[in-house]
């Protein structure tokens, strides 16, 4: 027989020879990192037909890493269900806790001993420092020094000293989230006031008012013979500008070759157009549009 078979988990006892006589026996033992469990044979014999009798390394079992308990407020999950070297142990924390350390440990062989690649991690309670204080506003629980996971605070704006109120820009309620950080940035309290939206050859159909503060929404439609260029709905945004910009009503072309665009505002068109000053929400002639901006 030629050289006997080689195995992942088993090694030949003694030095191999290039050739073996019929009837000659070779013995194996489990390699480092493995241990033998009976009853499978760990030897083979050179048979009369010059082949080795069947032998396997299935009796050699991998050494195992020490048991690791679930971390307090968390869980250790064996990726492949065993502690043998080559195993992976995954760690997760319960909701409201975060992991300190490595989230995966590997069972590794150090000479004959199976050991973990590091120390098991810890699961610590998620805590947040107090949320930011804001100018012209305040939040609830301002006296609390440490916030736990999912604890929430609500912001509100102070009364404004002038005629226009402070608007709260951003999320009014924020909570202590996963990475010990607040779910959103702190909001802002400031006066937001948009210019009066004038659309010539058109009219407002909703959102009437004299003053337009944060998130005020106005809708328009064009007079008959005009089409809307832009959006029929605009919103007063935090930088005191309309978004999208105030639309325009453009005259429909009467050229037979061009098809006029349809207005984005639907519904019947008025046959009679009253003077601008009679439209609800428009300033009276003595008020003037510019005078209305910054009072």
């Amino acid at each position: 027989c030629e050289a006997p078979p080689t195995f992942e988990a088993m090694e030949l006892i003694g030095k191999p020879k290039p050739y073996y006589r019929v009837g000659e026996r070779v013995d194996y033992k489990c390699k480092k990192g493995y241990f033998y469990i009976p009853p499978l044979a760990t030897h083979t014999i050179c048979d009369r037909n010059h082949t080795w009798l069947p032998v396997s390394d299935e009796g050699c079992y991998r050494e195992m890493c020490p048991h690791i308990r679930d971390p307090l407020n968390g869980e250790a999950i064996l990726a492949n269900g065993s502690y043998e070297f080559g195993a992976e142990l995954h760690f997760i924390c319960n909701e409201g806790y975060y992991l300190i350390g490595k989230d995966i440990l590997y069972c590794e062989l150090k000479d004959t001993v199976a050991i973990w690649s590091g120390k098991p991690p810890l699961c610590e309670k998620i805590l947040c420092t107090p949320p930011p204080k804001i100018k012209n506003g305040k939040h609830t629980f301002s006296e609390v020094e440490v916030f736990e996971y999912l604890d929430a605070v609500t912001y509100s704006c102070d009364p404004a000293p002038g005629p226009d109120p402070f608007s709260l820009i951003g999320e009014s309620m924020i909570y202590c989230g996963n990475n010990s950080t607040w779910s959103h940035a702190a909001p802002e309290c400031k006066v937001v006031k948009c210019r009066f939206p004038v659309v010539e050859n058109g009219k407002q159909i909703s959102g009437f008012g004299k003053k337009f503060y944060y998130k005020a929404t106005v809708m328009f439609e064009c007079d008959k013979g005009y089409y809307l260029n832009g959006s029929d709905k605009i919103v007063c945004e935090s930088n005191s500008t309309w978004d999208p910009p105030v639309p325009k009503c453009l005259k429909v072309s009467t050229s037979p070759t061009t098809k006029s665009p349809t207005s984005s505002a639907s519904g019947p068109r008025p046959t009679y157009k009253p003077p601008v000053s009679n439209y609800p929400g428009y300033p009276k002639p003595d008020e003037g549009i510019l005078n209305n901006l910054d009072d």
């Epitope: 033998y36 009976p38 050494e63 195992m64 000479d111 004959t112 001993v113």
Partner: antibody
């Protein structure tokens, strides 16, 4: 045929020392881990210590840690247990046992045991 | 260190089946070895895990495992099976230490 023969047991006073030996034959001693186990009279088995094939890895039960030392001499095919600061509760039959691999494995062969009596 | 718990004594009628159990946290993760010890003799390795017997150990001996409990089952118990039986496994405290159960005295009636 695997054979393990313990020696060195006897009567010893509390606080004194004793060294047990385990002579191995019938297998390649230098490629197997070894264990010591004891049994107090009328009690169960107690695992004490392990040493890897080359002596690099050693482990001890809490009850003997700091007092007992395991060692081996592969050139003499012999395992040792040095027992210091002996107490009455160390009175037991002591066995050496062969591991089934280079490491801790399972305890597949045992010696016949040696009796240690700690008494004043 | 953690413990493996065994019933102190179990009896079985000759020819009947008996189950010797061993409980412990470590058994959720590791197999158990079983040893038979007769009075005045050294322990003898009889079983590892579910059904790994050394040559010379009767096929009457088998093993099973579920959760944190391992069992040594003797089918058709004989008078020569009367002995103390010990389970042996890893310590569950995160070390490489080994631990034995307290032992079960099997009486064959």
């Amino acid at each position: 045929q695997v054979q393990l023969v313990e020696s060195g047991g006897g009567v010893v006073q509390p606080g004194r020392s004793l060294r047990l030996s385990c002579a191995a034959s019938g297998f390649t001693f230098s490629t197997y881990g070894m264990h010591w186990v004891r049994q107090a009279p009328g009690k169960g088995l107690e695992w004490l210590s392990f040493i890897s094939y080359d002596g690099d890895e050693k482990y001890y039960a809490d009850s003997v840690k700091g007092r007992f030392t395991i060692s081996r001499d592969n050139s003499k095919n012999t395992l040792y247990l040095q027992m210091n600061s002996l107490r009455a509760e160390d009175t037991a039959v002591y066995w050496c046992a062969k591991a089934s691999g280079y490491g801790m494995g399972i305890l597949d062969y045992w010696g016949q045991g040696t009796l240690v009596t700690v008494s004043s | 260190s953690s413990e493996l718990t065994q019933d102190p004594a179990v009896s079985v009628a000759l020819g009947q089946t008996v189950r010797i159990t061993c409980q412990g946290d470590s058994l959720r993760s590791y197999y158990v070895s079983w040893f038979q010890q007769k009075p005045g003799q050294a322990p003898v390795f009889v079983m590892y895990g579910q059904n790994n017997r050394p040559s010379g150990i009767s096929e009457r001996f088998s093993g099973s495992s579920s959760g944190n409990t391992a069992s040594l089952i003797i089918t058709g118990a004989q008078a020569e099976d009367e002995a103390d039986y010990y389970c042996h496994s890893r310590d569950s405290s995160g070390t490489h230490l080994r631990v034995f159960g307290g032992g079960t005295k099997l009486t064959v009636l």
